[in-house]
Amino acid sequence: MGRARDAILDALENLTAEELKKFKLKLLSVPLREGYGRIPRGALLSMDALDLTDKLVSFYLETYGAELTANVLRDMGLQEMAGQLQAATHQGSGAAPAGIQAPPQSAAKPGLHFIDQHRAALIARVTNVEWLLDALYGKVLTDEQYQAVRAEPTNPSKMRKLFSFTPAWNWTCKDLLLQALRESQSYLVEDLERS
């Protein structure tokens, strides 16, 4: 996933704090194509531009994610920005027809660990959290942290709580989480590694 994701991120990073807030609120009510779910309000409102980009791409894929972002920007009166987003998305011959997902391109950020790079997608898509916690317990998670994550009611909130501890982790600790994810959610990791 390359050009479209970067174009979405560029657009969102160019919004003021007030505009970003307005964007999120409009995203909660914008009409969606049949078959696509809405990003949960609780998760949405606390996201920064980077998290929101990851969430848009993980929920809607790149092509539709960019189209949706442009629609919301247009609805906010930011026609020029919407036009720039769509132009960036359709540059060259890399554009796929509407509704068709272009083949993914590598856009890995060299300085970021997989865990940080895909934070939003992992929060949204990891299901087997209990096993992850057991795999990490005593290695990177204290008893107190383990209990705190388990106490959360949903998988996304569990993952969000788990991510609240990762800023203190070094690369090796994050590798342990990645390894546990590989073992318990192999298809998800393979999917994200391509992005």
Epitope: Q101, R125, T127, Q185, S186, Y187, E190, D191
Partner: antibody, heavy 114, light 109 residues
Amino acid sequence: EVQLVESGGGFVKPGGSLKLSCAASGFTFSNYAMSWVRQTPEKRLEWVATIYSGGIFTYYPDSVKGRFTISRDSAKNTLYLQMTSLRSEDTAIYYCARLGGSYWGQGTLVTVSA
Amino acid sequence: QAVVTQESALTTSPGETVTLTCRSSTGAVTTNNYANWVQEKPDHFFTGLIGGTDNRPPGVPARFSGSLIGDKAALTITGAQTEDEAIYFCALWYNNHWVFGGGTKLTVL
């Protein structure tokens, strides 16, 4: 280049056993989920088993649960399918596949008949 | 147990664009179903075309693309060629099991 090469197929009587192997190359075998899929004589594709990267998580359809066991040896880059209590309806071409990326082997024929 | 449904047969002409779809009985297909598309040519020769909804393995022609359209997974062949005449199977992952569709027989004439 990803390559998957199956072996171990053959003719077996009902109630018998057979072990299939799949030699994988061209990718980091230990990082990926692997599966067995079969094509029945009626040309249907049926999923048979999946094993996640670490070998801890294995999944089977009810039709083979308790009779078939999927395993992997990451040191040898090899996937296995141990089949026991074979039935005539297990007759099929068995394919080793990395479905997350859509890579398939050439298949090995298993015939179960009296 | 989920049921995965494909068109039983489609016909197209060389150079035309054709879209095959894959529907789930449980609701909308999402990226978490990791839609997989495989082509079967005569003599049980299978070639994986798409994995993880939209990922094309190396060596697969660029005319094949995968996507989600509406509530279904889709395989689009842009500029079909006579050698694309084959049976196309899709498979969807449901958290702990794969389910294959019955296949679409594509005729190119």
